[in-house]
Structures are given as structure tokens and as C-alpha cells.
């Protein structure tokens, strides 16, 4: 049967009808509506928006739309005691203070409740001391400082530029180096693209612009006070001293005008090489401390933010499936923003809104998807993926038994150059096939497919004629679904040209200047890129919910497993003496990957041939596909990261945003030459190879014939 017959609908109600219903003008209208005032998590404004979305999703035709609330730990600046950084002279007088707020953009001068720039979850404190410039504060930057340059950060305040890695990793690294405070700043080298004007005249970051953001190291825990369990009315909460992932030293972000004032006086060591220099007219000296004339001056931080248990609200909409109502395809993105959320998240939320409207239109005409579709507007993503994680913790038993797929829908754009997709290998073929059917919005590709423009602009480094698809990392709401629960996940958005624009993210990320006008004037005036992203996200959801056989290809997992096994083996072989001494063998992993490859191939052959009119066999084959991602979950989790349970992928221990393959083995090998007990360290490598090999073999066996 076709999917139309399976769901008792007229043939016109197919993917084309759904896609044709999506309109750029609606996305534009929704974006405007969502961005006129701030929607900070835990505020009345964001609660009101939740209720508005609930009401509109009901109007659009969903079967039910409910609010799911949780009481989680959030962080806010003290309204009467602002955060700032000073340069103080030998008498303790403040001779320079950083700004207390960003100059508001034109038209927003009278908007209230714009939260000033702050690092969410920073502890309170007023440390003072000498400054050390630590580049991006990456693991390798601290290795360079401590091992090569013999610079000790203990008792120092470090200043790090934003970019390259998640800010929480920067703070963790600074803490481990013994720093007593962290100043984060946006360097023009990373947040000011050459030849583009500053906002409001262009999409670049002005000198007074500042990136907000949380600095947690949650490792997938969700609410810091209720790890593993929902923060509901009867929750047992940890004391603040036992909370997960909180930083122990004060942290504060600044813009490049203020950074200039701090960095221009730096003395001490010169930067080790050009990769430590940004674009400010300062020497980028590492320190510690200020140069000659200013050597008696110190830096002092004044941080007075508070952590507060606060109510948050997710909106959960349901479109019940006609044939398999107990199989869930989830489309989710967050609603909370740091300020106006012009890009993050409302460019994504507007797309979700239009997707819901289109599905609702079809439903009102008598159509239903084969499987149930759940739509989610998550709260408190910016405070550590809290809304999505708490909901998943509350519903984990249902999700692990019924979850088919999760499609994430944060920012639809971070540029307007080409498509960017990160997903499980199970979705590669779905994404390829879908983008071949969609029109490219790109100039110079009129009449061509999205697949063609994407492949041309972002080619795969391994397979010619195919586009790049990246590994899932974290830093967004798919984390709990993929990394903890093992539900096949994916995300798509339009991105910049990474070749020519080497700045990190987009320049106005998490600043007050992320407005509706930023998008409408500079990124996507016709909203054609938003529409394309809506077609990709919506099309994926449609196919996942409506195709008779799930659109997952397990052979693509086999291909990447081989690649990842090769990569980790090559890393390990860089220590041949220890490999030989400790008899470290990858034989079990390569054998498991070989078995997986053969079994996946046979499964795919059976998938072509089986009787799709037999509902029991169909369900059995689909369940094998659905549960394959689940089979990569280790219930014990990764070492010291119990909520990262996927054995093939985890967020990098050095950058939450990046995905790492065979993370257990990778982390065991990382910097192994510096370990005090090599025998123990190589023993852990061997154990991680064993866990990985076992998991791959066990996953392979889930694809074998059942009896």
C-alpha cells in the first residue's frame, strides 16, 4: 500500500501538498511577532508567548496542545547591583569600568527588561589580580601556556576570546588551570567580517555588542539540581554545593571596545605565534599583568548574579497518527531567547510555527500522518537545554519505547550561503533524497535542486558528488534525545561560507542586536532561505511520520563505523611502543565493524523483499530500524559523563558543540603520554575498545533475522 492508502486519505494529501502549503510570508510574519520583546526563560513575557503558541497551535488544528512546566535552576543579574570589570590602581581606585549594558538598537530604546550581558550561572565574587591572555581558552591553548611558555595561571584572572569552542569548556579549562576569574570577549577577528558594516548598518558586531550565554558543564544532566529526573512538584533537589556543572569562579563577558582597554596594557610574554593574535590594535601579550608603566594596576571583577529556582514552560503539541499512534516523530525547537532572539531561536520557532500550520491545514482536510507527530516549543534552552531535558526525563520510558526520530529546530539561519545538516547516519539517505526534490533558493542555481547547490558549495570531504553531513555534537535540544536516549536525530539550517568567513558563529549571536530587522534587512529579505529550511525540516518530519517503511538506511551506519574505527586506530598507533608493550588490539573492533557491515547489507536486502502488506512483518522490520540507534546506547554511560550514553557519538570533552566518534576510546587516548600511570591509562584504552567492539557487535545483532 502507499502511505496515502495506509492513512485513508486522498492522494493529493502527500508530501507535495504539505510543502506547497508552507509560505515564506507566513514565516516572516511569525518571526516579527516573536521578536518584538525579549523572551528570557523564566520571565512573564516568555510564559505569555508559551500560551500564545499553545492557543495558535490549537487553532492550526493539532489534536492537543499542553504546557509542561518544571521548576529549574536559572541565573539572573542583580537588577540593583550590576556586574562589571574594573582596572584599579595601587590605591584601589577604579580608573576604568566596563559598560553596564549594550547601547540599544534603533527603535528599541524604550524596550524594558533587556537583560544586560552576563555569563549565566557565574558565582558571585570580586576577585582582583593580574590578567593573563589565554587566546580561545581551548585545551591546546592552556597546554601552550603551561607546558611550552611555563606561564602559571594560578591566582590570575584570565581573559579569553570567544569562538572555536563552547564557552563552558573555556571556563572549565580556566578553572583547571587555577584561574580565579574569567573575562570573555568578542574579538573582531572572530566576530567582524571584513567589508561589512556594524549593526544597524550591516550584520557585524559593534564594539559595544556582547555575547551572553551560559557557562555550565552539565554533560547532558539538565536541571543542575535534579540530574536524571524531572524537576517536578515533588522533586528532591540537590544543595547548590552538589549541583551539577556550576562554575566555581566568577565569569563575565565584554565587547571589543572594553576588551581593547584591558588588552592594550598587557605586558609579560609576547604571543607565541600569529594564531594568538586577533584584530584589535593591541600587542596580544600574554602577561601575566600589565606592562611597565601600568604594572601596579590590577583588574577587578564585580559579579553579583544570583541562581534561582524558576518555573519554565514547554509547549507540547500532538498530531495523532492514524496507523501507528504509538510511534513518535518529534519536531522541537526552543522559544526562550537572551534578548529579542531575531535569529536564535525565533528564526527556528517561526519555521516550526509554519510547519505546524501546514500539517494542521492537511489535518483539517481529513488527512492524518501514519505515525504520531509531536511538536515542541522548549523553554530554557539557553540555560543548559533545560526544558527539553526535563521533558525527556519525565517521558523517558515512553520515548525509549516509542521514539522514532527527533528533528531539531533552533535558528534556521546562521548565514545565507548553503545548507548545513548534522544528523545520524541513518538519515543520510533521507536527507539526500529529500534535497534532490527541493528547489535551491541560491542565486545562480535557479531551476536546480537544493542537493545540487548544497553539494557544489559544501562537498563531502570523502565522497565525490555528495554534500557534507556532519556529526551531531551538542549545544542544542537534540542532546537528550540522541546522546542520552538513542533516538535517531537530525538538524538542518542555512549557514555561511566557512571558507571565506572564518568568524565563529554569526557576529551578533546572543547580543541585543539580534533583531527582526537583522534578518529582514541583511540575512534573508525574501525569507527564501527560511522557507527552504522549513521544507527540509518539515519534509524530514513528513517522511519519517508517513513513509510505510522508515526512511533509515543502516548501511550508511556501517560506512561511518568503518571510517571511525580507522580514525581511532590511527590515533592509537601514534603510540606504537605502548601499543606493543600493553598488547593493545583493535582486532575486536574491526571484527565487529565487519560483522555490522555484513549484517546491515543482508538486512537491507530483506527490507527490499519483504511483504509490506503484512502489518506484523512491516512493524517488525520498522522496529529493527527504530531500535538500531537505541542499540548504540550503553546504560552505564561514558566515564564521568553518565548522561552521554551513545557509544559512537558524544559531544567532545573539549568542545560541547563538536561531535566526537568513539568518544570513550578517544578520551582514553587523549594526552595519554602525560598520564602518571601509563599501565592504568592503557588499560582504560583497552577497556574502551572492548566496550565499543561489544556495542557495535550487539547493535549488529539487532539487525539479524529475529529467529
Amino acid at each position: 500500500k502507499s502511505s496515502n492508502e495506509a492513512t485513508n486519505i486522498t492522494p493529493k494529501h502527500n508530501m507535495k501538498a504539505f510543502l506547497d502549503e508552507l509560505k515564506a510570508e507566513n514565516i516572516k510574519k511569525f518571526l516579527y511577532n516573536f521578536t518584538q520583546i525579549p523572551h528570557l526563560a523564566g520571565t512573564e513575557q516568555n510564559f505569555q508567548l508559551a500560551k500564545q503558541i499553545q492557543s495558535q497551535w490549537k487553532e492550526f488544528g493539532l489534536d492537543s496542545v499542553e504546557l509542561a512546566h518544571y521548576d529549574v535552576l536559572l541565573s539572573y543579574p542583580n537588577k540593583t547591583h550590576p556586574n562589571y570589570i574594573s582596572i584599579i590602581n595601587e590605591d584601589g581606585n577604579e580608573i576604568f569600568n566596563t559598560s553596564l549594558f549594550e547601547p540599544p538598537p534603533p527603535g528599541y530604546e524604550n524596550v524594558s527588561d533587556i537583560v544586560p550581558p552576563f555569563s549565566a550561572f557565574s558565582p558571585q565574587g570580586m576577585p582582583e589580580g593580574d590578567l593573563v591572555y589565554v587566546n580561545y581558552a581551548r585545551t591546546e591553548d592552556f597546554f601552550k601556556l603551561e607546558r611550552d611558555m611555563k606561564i602559571n595561571c594560578s591566582g590570575k584572572i584570565v581573559i579569553a576570546r570567544y569562538g572555536k569552542v563552547f564557552r563552558g569548556n573555556k571556563v572549565k579549562n580556566a578553572q583547571l588551570a587555577g584561574a580565579k576569574g574569567v573575562i570573555l570577549y568578542s574579538d573582531p577577528a572572530d566576530y567582524f567580517a571584513p567589508g561589512v558594516k556594524s549593526y544597524p548598518d550591516g550584520w557585524n558586531l559593534p564594539g559595544g555588542g556582547v555575547q551572553r550565554g551560559n557557562i555550565l558543564n552539565l554533560n547532558g544532566a539538565g536541571d543542575p539540581l535534579t540530574p536524571g529526573y524531572p524537576a517536578n512538584e515533588y522533586a528532591y533537589r540537590r544543595g547548590i554545593a552538589e549541583a551539577v556543572g556550576l562554575p566555581s569562579i566568577p565569569v563575565h563577558p565584554i565587547g571589543y571596545y572594553d576588551a581593547q582597554k584591558l588588552l592594550e596594557k598587557m605586558g609579560g610574554s609576547a604571543p607565541p605565534d600569529s594564531s594568538w593574535r586577533g584584530s584589535l590594535k593591541v600587542p596580544y601579550n600574554v602577561g601575566p599583568g600589565f606592562t611597565g608603566n601600568f604594572s601596579t594596576q590590577k583588574v577587578k571583577m564585580h559579579i553579583h548574579s544570583t541562581n534561582e529556582v524558576t518555573r519554565i514552560y514547554n509547549v507540547i503539541g500532538t498530531l495523532r497518527g492514524a496507523v501507528e499512534p504509538d510511534r513518535y516523530v518529534i519536531l522541537g525547537g526552543h522559544r526562550d531567547s537572551w534578548v529579542f532572539g531575531g535569529i536564535d531561536p525565533q528564526s527556528g520557532a517561526a519555521v516550526v510555527h509554519e510547519i505546524v500550520r501546514s500539517f494542521g491545514t492537511l489535518k483539517k482536510e481529513g488527512w492524518r500522518p501514519r505515525r504520531t507527530i509531536l511538536f515542541a516549543s522548549w523553554d530554557a534552552e539557553e540555560f543548559g537545554l533545560l526544558g527539553s531535558t526535563e521533558w525527556a526525563e519525565e517521558n523517558s520510558r515512553l520515548l525509549q519505547e516509542r521514539g522514532v526520530a527527533y528533528i531539531n529546530a533552533d535558528s534556521s539561519i546562521e548565514g545565507n550561503y548553503t545548507l548545513r545538516v548534522d544528523c545520524t547516519p541513518l538519515m543520510y539517505s533521507l536527507v539526500h533524497n529529500l534535497t534532490k526534490e527541493l528547489k535551491s533558493p541560491d542565486e545562480g542555481f535557479e531551476g536546480k535542486s537544493l542537493y545540487e547547490s548544497w553539494t557544489k558549495k559544501s562537498p563531502s570531504p570523502e565522497f565525490s558528488g555528495m554534500p557534507r553531513i556532519s556529526k551531531l555534537g551538542s549545544g542544542n535540544d537534540f542532546e537528550v534525545f540522541f546522546q542520552r536516549l538513542g533516538i535517531a536525530s537530525g538538524r538542518a539550517r542555512y549557514t555561511k561560507n566557512w571558507e571565506t568567513n572564518k568568524f565563529s558563529g554569526y557576529p551578533l549571536y546572543h547580543s541585543v542586536y539580534e533583531t527582526y530587522e537583522l534578518v529582514e534587512k541583511f540575512y534573508d529579505p525574501m525569507f527564501k532561505y527560511h522557507l527552504t529550511v522549513a521544507q527540509v525540516r518539515g519534509g524530514m518530519v513528513f517522511e519519517l511520520a508517513n513513509s510505510i517503511v522508515l526512511p533509515f538506511d543502516c548501511r550508511d551506519y556501517a560506512v561511518v563505523l568503518r571510517k571511525y574505527a580507522d580514525k581511532i586506530y590511527s590515533i592509537s598507533m601514534k603510540h606504537p611502543q605502548e601499543m606493543k608493550t600493553y598488547s593493545v588490539s583493535f582486532d575486536s573492533l574491526f571484527s565487529a565493524v565487519k560483522n555490522f557491515t555484513e549484517i546491515a547489507s543482508k538486512f537491507s536486502e530483506r527490507l527490499q523483499d519483504f511483504d509490506k502488506s503484512n502489518p506484523i512483518v512491516l512493524r517488525m522490520m520498522n522496529d529493527q530500524l527504530m531500535f538500531l540507534e537505541r542499540a548504540f546506547i550503553d546504560p552505564l554511560g561514558l566515564p564521568d559523563r553518565p548522561f552521554y550514553r551513545h557509544v559512537i557519538y558524544a559531544p567532545s570533552s573539549h568542545n560541547k558543540y563538536a561531535g566526537e566518534s568513539f568518544p570513550g576510546i578517544y578520551d582514553a587516548l587523549f594526552d595519554i603520554e602525560s598520564k602518571v600511570d601509563p599501565s592504568k591509562a592503557w588499560g582504560e584504552v583497552k577497556r574502551q575498545i572492548y566496550v565499543a567492539a561489544f556495542t557495535v557487535q550487539a547493535a549488529a545483532e539487532t539487525l539479524s533475522e529475529v529467529a
Epitope: K567, S570, S572, P576, K580
Partner: nanobody, 113 residues
Framework: EVQLLESGGGLVQPGGSLRLSCAAS????????LSWVRQAPGKGLEWVSS????????DYADNVKGRFTISRDNSKNTLYLQMNSLRVEDTAVYYC??????WGQGTLVTVSS
Amino acid sequence: EVQLLESGGGLVQPGGSLRLSCAASGFSFSSYALSWVRQAPGKGLEWVSSIGENDGTTDYADNVKGRFTISRDNSKNTLYLQMNSLRVEDTAVYYCVKDGVHWGQGTLVTVSS
């Protein structure tokens, strides 16, 4: 039983070239990544290069990058190392390695004028 047999070593002048081979048997050759490792006289083992299973990804130590090329012929169950622009410091016994624990007996490369 896994067997790895290296050949192709010898004496060569600086700037010269050699091609090492490693004939493999006793296992499914195309299912394994393979490596070359060397040991200079009086020194420890040093990784040189690795290649993925199916003619896949290659990786090189910094000091041989651009001079050495690893390759494999799965139909002949053979691994190769093409060494160009050889230097005196490349003098070593070169070993073929499968999965980290199976090593060949090595072939000696001497670079000397």
C-alpha cells in the same frame, strides 16, 4: 594464523627512493586498517603512517608527510609504503602492523651516502 611479511628494504643514498611491501595472510585483509611503524637504531618505536580499511583515509607522521605515501591493494592482500626524498634519519627497521598487536618481522632501510 595472522602473518605479515615485509620486503623492499635496503641501502639507499639520501634523496633516493624505496618501496616497501607487506604481504598479509590469515585474516580478512580488506576489513582492517593497517600501519607502518619504524625503529631507528637505539631508539624507540615510531609511528609512520596508517591507512583505512577500504583504500580509505591515510594519516602520516609530520616528519614523513609529503615524502612517504601509504597504499594498499586489497586484491593482493598487500600494504605498501612508497618512500621518496629519503634522509639519513629515516634509517630504521620498518614494521607492518595490523590492529596494534600483530607485527611483521620488519625490513631494514639504511639511508647513507
